[in-house]
């Protein structure tokens, strides 16, 4: 039954679509951005515990004008999945649970067999998502490769397919800044640099506060990070613009330590305003 | 090294004014002072050694009154830009740093109550 006039089941199982996705909610997934080659996904490792693999399998005639040629029922239709050491099988989801296959993995969750129906009928199309744990991805992991192979006891030659993603370690750092006050006024008299003794003689005071937040793991394993502030100290003709009096880093050095930034500010060694001591 | 690209050049370059006497408000222009085009920057760099949750950089500075009086009396408003970013040096080739820079503008005006003394 379901095998056409010749009684030989010539199926046409195809992996119509296969792409890595980020998991937004239990049954909601979003395709990862692709590299410039258009074939390799970009996976930013920033605390996502799972990655999804969207799969669409069809059993349709290869030539709609000759529907009897193939696309017959695919008996014992299966998808065989081989995972790299950095990924482990965690589960399977489908937007419509009617399309959810039965997927079973080995003890190490590195090989998965998904039953697509016995038979997977002519004209059938299913879309489902493998949920893969990313806990095995380390900072040395640069690529993910999952091997996929459709299988059936119906007559059809099937070749393996590989899905790839480049892995980036995305540092979950954000930076923000604020100046107080946000409006400044100038006034007074023109005075030469050599006549300056105290910071109070310069002009109005401004304080900048730059905050760096780290939403992820401690940074020290990843390399050396620097917080830089581009301070406009001169105008084009070399005259002073904003004079830096004091630079202080709070945090980022270990508990209770204050950071040393370079170069040193206040190069004219002006007297500090007593209110700022 | 993962850093930020050089800031885009502002669309116009306004030369410092050579006169400091008052100009009618209608003639005054707005101007931006930003590195590297219309200002020169010194980069204060602070290593983040052990960095768990947050770090705050405090920088105190002063406007250099004399420069503004000499150069920018004919300007309606001046926007002075301070930029900050994070850079990471690492042997790991696939590190990616997003949202790692910020721009902090301050507006500078001639004090309307000021009596300018040459």
């Amino acid at each position: 039954q379901g095998c056409g006039q010749d009684k030989i089941c010539q199926s046409n199982l195809q992996l119509e679509r296969y792409q890595f996705c980020s998991r937004i909610s239990d049954t909601e997934f979003q395709a990862l951005p692709m590299d410039l080659d258009g074939r390799t996904a970009l996976f930013a490792l920033s605390g996502q515990p799972f990655i999804g693999l969207e799969l669409t399998v069809t059993n349709l005639p290869s030539d709609p004008s000759r529907p009897q040629a193939d696309g017959d029922d695919a008996h014992e239709a299966q998808l065989l999945v081989t995972l790299p050491a950095s990924l482990r099988y965690s589960g399977v989801r489908a937007l419509d649970s009617v399309e959810k296959p039965l997927c079973l993995s080995n003890d190490s969750a590195s090989h998965v067999e998904c039953e697509l129906g016995n038979p997977m009928k002519r004209g059938a199309q299913v879309t489902f998502y493998l949920i893969l744990s990313t806990s095995g991805i380390t900072i040395e992991t640069t690529e993910l490769e999952v091997k996929l192979l459709l299988a059936t006891i119906s007559e059809q030659e099937l070749d393996p397919v590989s899905v790839r993603a480049h892995v980036f370690i995305e540092l979950p750092l954000s930076i923000s800044g604020v100046a107080t006050p946000q409006q400044l006024f100038f006034s007074g008299e023109v005075k030469g640099e050599s006549a300056m003794r105290s910071e109070r003689e310069l002009g109005r005071k401004v304080k900048y506060e730059v905050t760096v937040s780290n939403q992820g793991q401690s940074l020290n394993t990843l390399g050396s990070a620097n917080l830089n502030i581009m301070w406009p100290h001169e105008i084009a003709n070399g005259k002073w613009l904003l004079y830096p009096m004091r630079v202080e880093l709070e945090g980022g050095q270990g508990p209770g330590k204050r950071g040393i930034c370079s170069p040193r500010p206040n190069i004219l060694q002006l007297d500090v305003d007593s209110r700022d001591r | 090294e993962l850093g930020q690209p050089e800031p885009q050049e502002p669309p116009e370059k306004v030369e410092p004014s050579t006169s400091w006497w008052p100009v009618s408000s209608a003639e005054k222009r707005n101007m931006t002072l930003d590195c590297p085009r219309t200002a020169k920057c010194v980069v204060f760099s602070c290593p983040l050694y052990s960095f768990d949750r947050a770090a705050v950089l405090h920088v105190w500075g002063r406007l250099w009154n004399s420069t503004f009086l000499e150069e920018y009396m004919a300007v309606k408003s001046l926007e002075v830009i301070v930029r900050a970013n994070i850079t990471v040096k690492s042997s790991i080739k696939n590190l990616l740093l997003r949202d790692a820079s910020t721009v902090i503008p301050v507006m500078v005006y001639l004090d309307p109550m000021a009596v300018v003394v040459e």
């Epitope: 589960g91 399977v92 959810k100 004209g123 949920i131 | -």
Partner: antibody, heavy 121, light 112 residues
Framework: QVPLQQSGPQLVRPGASVKISCKAS????????MHWVKQRPGQGLDWIGK????????RLNQEFRDKATLTVDKSSSTAYLQLSSPTSEDSAVYYC?????FGEGWYFDVWGAGTTVTVSS | DVVMTQIPLSLPVSLGDQASISCRSS???????????LHWYLQKPGQSPKLLIY???NRFSGVPDRFSGSGSGTDFTLKISRVEAEDLGVYFC?????????FGGGTKLEIK
């Protein structure tokens, strides 16, 4: 051997949560969805939701979203239904029922005998 | 939610007669995959329901061939060609095309 063996009747106080069990035997527990159905005395049937024992995926009827929690223990092939803050409206017979997989079997081919829950002070 | 309406509520029959129960859904039960997930259950007094017919017209294993199901879209019928004493009880139709899955209110088959 009964394929779905449900726990005995329960009398619970209003507000005290109740957990009933359904032990599967004679088939591969992880190959079939497990569903829960409510039947109030002399009334029809209400589908509460289903759970996939292979990976604990749960689909609940929105009407029971704040009332029912479905869980499984694969090691003992047992499914559980927990009812939170029960009221007299929750007094009913609760059935577990085996569903099917993958496009076939979207019906209940095996039913438990039911667990009577009575909520009374 | 899809509302399932069964007619009649009660169906008195004589043993050996034909019985017919109607079930109507508030929206089409044809799934986008082409299947129609409409099923029939029988609940005998003091027992749990048992599956009779799945996907409109397929008899479940062990169900006598006097039971047959038909229909499409939103209108479905369960027929019992010759009612026997063991057929008495409440018949429920059920749909699993749309979430949440829903049941009809039931039709009680009883002896005249």
């Amino acid at each position: 051997q009964v394929p779905l063996q449900q726990s005995g009747p329960q009398l619970v106080r209003p507000g005290a949560s109740v957990k009933i069990s359904c032990k599967a035997s004679g088939y591969s527990f992880t190959r079939y969805w497990m569903h829960w159905v409510k039947q109030r005395p002399g009334q029809g049937l209400d589908w509460i939701g289903k759970i996939d024992p292979s990976d604990s995926e749960t689909r609940l009827n929105q009407e029971f979203r704040d009332k029912a929690t479905l869980t499984v223990d694969k090691s003992s092939s047992t499914a559980y239904l927990q009812l939170s803050s029960p009221t007299s409206e929750d007094s009913a017979v609760y059935y577990c029922a085996r569903g099917g997989y993958f496009g076939e079997g979207w019906y209940f081919d095996v039913w438990g005998a039911g667990t009577t829950v009575t909520v009374s002070s | 939610d899809v509302v399932m309406t069964q007619i009649p509520l009660s169906l008195p029959v004589s043993l050996g007669d034909q019985a017919s129960i109607s079930c109507r859904s508030s929206q089409s039960l044809v799934h986008r995959n082409g299947n129609t997930y409409l099923h029939w259950y029988l609940q005998k007094p003091g027992q749990s329901p048992k599956l009779l017919i799945y996907k409109v017209s397929n008899r479940f294993s062990g169900v006598p061939d006097r039971f047959s199901g038909s229909g499409s879209g939103t209108d479905f019928t369960l027929k019992i060609s010759r009612v026997e004493a063991e057929d008495l009880g409440v018949y429920f139709c059920s749909q699993s095309t749309h979430v949440p899955w829903t049941f009809g209110g039931g039709t009680k088959l009883e002896i005249k």
